[in-house]
């Protein structure tokens, strides 16, 4: 199956403090290789979660992604701040046998506005 | 079928105000992204400003910020761009353009309304 | 900003003949590309988006394509109406939106 990364929000919003998920999903997992969300695009991105194991404080992924056949890469981010505004981007890479993983595909970006807290 | 009719073009001197509409039909106005994009004599297209459908969400272009403002009446279906401190370089055909409700590009749009500033 | 550069400028060809129209970008835009015409007098009109789908209404003698940097729109066989001026626009790196300059396609 060709593969196709979406992520169907166009934008969320959050008030500050609390939580959000961005959804991402996958038409299929080939090529291997991993799947990175980052905000913001070009040399200013910023990496936010990848599907590799290491620890993110305050983003976790909301299905288990070791499991076989998962198509979803959806995260959550907690304890939303005014900082974490921003566009982010589900991407797709495959992994290179010696090189650097090359990015493939991406998803269209959530735009995450993050509002004032209700008093 | 969408009609996005654009009013309040004219002729005006530097540094006046000029507030220009967009009566929207044919949709459910409310639930879509909205967006100013402008076009100057001989030029091509420049994304102006936009906004969310609920209204609270907003951005502008740098070459306008601080001096237009975008707003809507959901229960008008209109939408409007208030524009202060005119300059020469603002002289363009106006157009309110109705995004697609999953990415930001532009289904509909309409004719146009044209600005002149000039002294 | 993502900078969209298309070339030519302008297109002089006759009726029945076959355009190709360049649209480049100053970083990868996946596919999150559209095209748009423009005809004097009249509200510009969505004719592809994802790069390469036709919008509803289309003619299929319009045909978009490419990925990442590099996309193309190809007219098959130009008829009258299609002398006009076209602009991509990415939708990827935003906002700010931003659309190429223009080609304007005229009759030779």
């Known amino acids: 199956k060709e593969l196709k990364v979406t992520q169907p929000e166009k934008s969320v919003s959050v008030a500050a403090g609390d939580s959000t998920v961005l959804n991402c999903t996958l038409t299929s997992l080939l090529p291997v290789g991993p799947i990175k969300w980052y905000r913001g695009v070009g040399q200013s991105r910023l990496l936010i979660y990848s599907f590799t194991g290491e620890h993110f404080p305050r983003v976790t992924n909301v299905s288990d992604a070791t499991k076989r056949n998962n198509m979803d890469f959806s995260i959550r981010i907690s304890n939303v701040t005014p900082e974490d505004a921003g566009t982010y981007y589900c991407v797709k890479f495959q992994k290179g046998p010696s090189e650097p993983d090359t990015e493939i595909q991406s998803g269209g970006g959530t735009e995450v506005y993050v509002l004032a807290k209700p008093s | 079928d969408v009609q996005l009719v654009e009013s309040g073009g004219g002729v005006v001197r530097p540094g006046e105000s000029l507030r220009l509409s967009c009566a929207a039909s044919?949709?459910?106005?409310?639930?879509?992204?909205m967006n100013w994009v402008r076009q100057a004599p001989g030029e091509g297209l420049e994304w102006v400003s936009l906004?969310?459908?609920?209204?609270?969400?907003?951005y502008y272009a740098d070459s306008v910020k601080g001096r237009f403002t975008i707003s809507r009446d959901n229960s008008k279906n209109t939408l409007y761009l208030q524009m202060n401190s005119l300059r020469a370089e603002d002289t363009a055909v106006y157009y309110c353009?109705?995004?697609?409700?999953?990415?930001?590009?532009?289904?509909?749009w309409g004719l146009g309304t044209l600005v002149t500033v000039s002294s | 900003e993502t900078v969209l550069t298309q070339s030519p400028g302008t297109l002089s060809l006759s009726p029945g003949e076959r355009a190709t129209l360049n649209c480049r970008a100053s970083q990868s835009v996946y596919s999150y590309l559209a095209w748009y015409q423009e005809r004097p007098g009249q509200a510009p009109r969505l004719l592809i988006y994802g790069a390469s789908t036709r919008a509803t209404g289309i003619p299929d003698r319009f045909s978009g394509s490419g990925s990442g940097t590099e996309f193309t729109l190809t007219i098959s066989s130009l008829e009258s109406d299609d002398f006009a001026v076209y602009y991509c626009q990415q939708y990827y790196d935003r906002p700010p939106l931003t659309f190429g300059g223009g080609t304007k396609v005229e009759i030779k």
């Open positions: 353009a109705k995004e697609n409700n999953r990415y930001r590009f532009f289904d509909d």
């Open positions: 906004i969310s459908g609920s209204g609270e969400i907003i």
């Open positions: 044919g949709f459910t106005f409310s639930s879509y992204d």
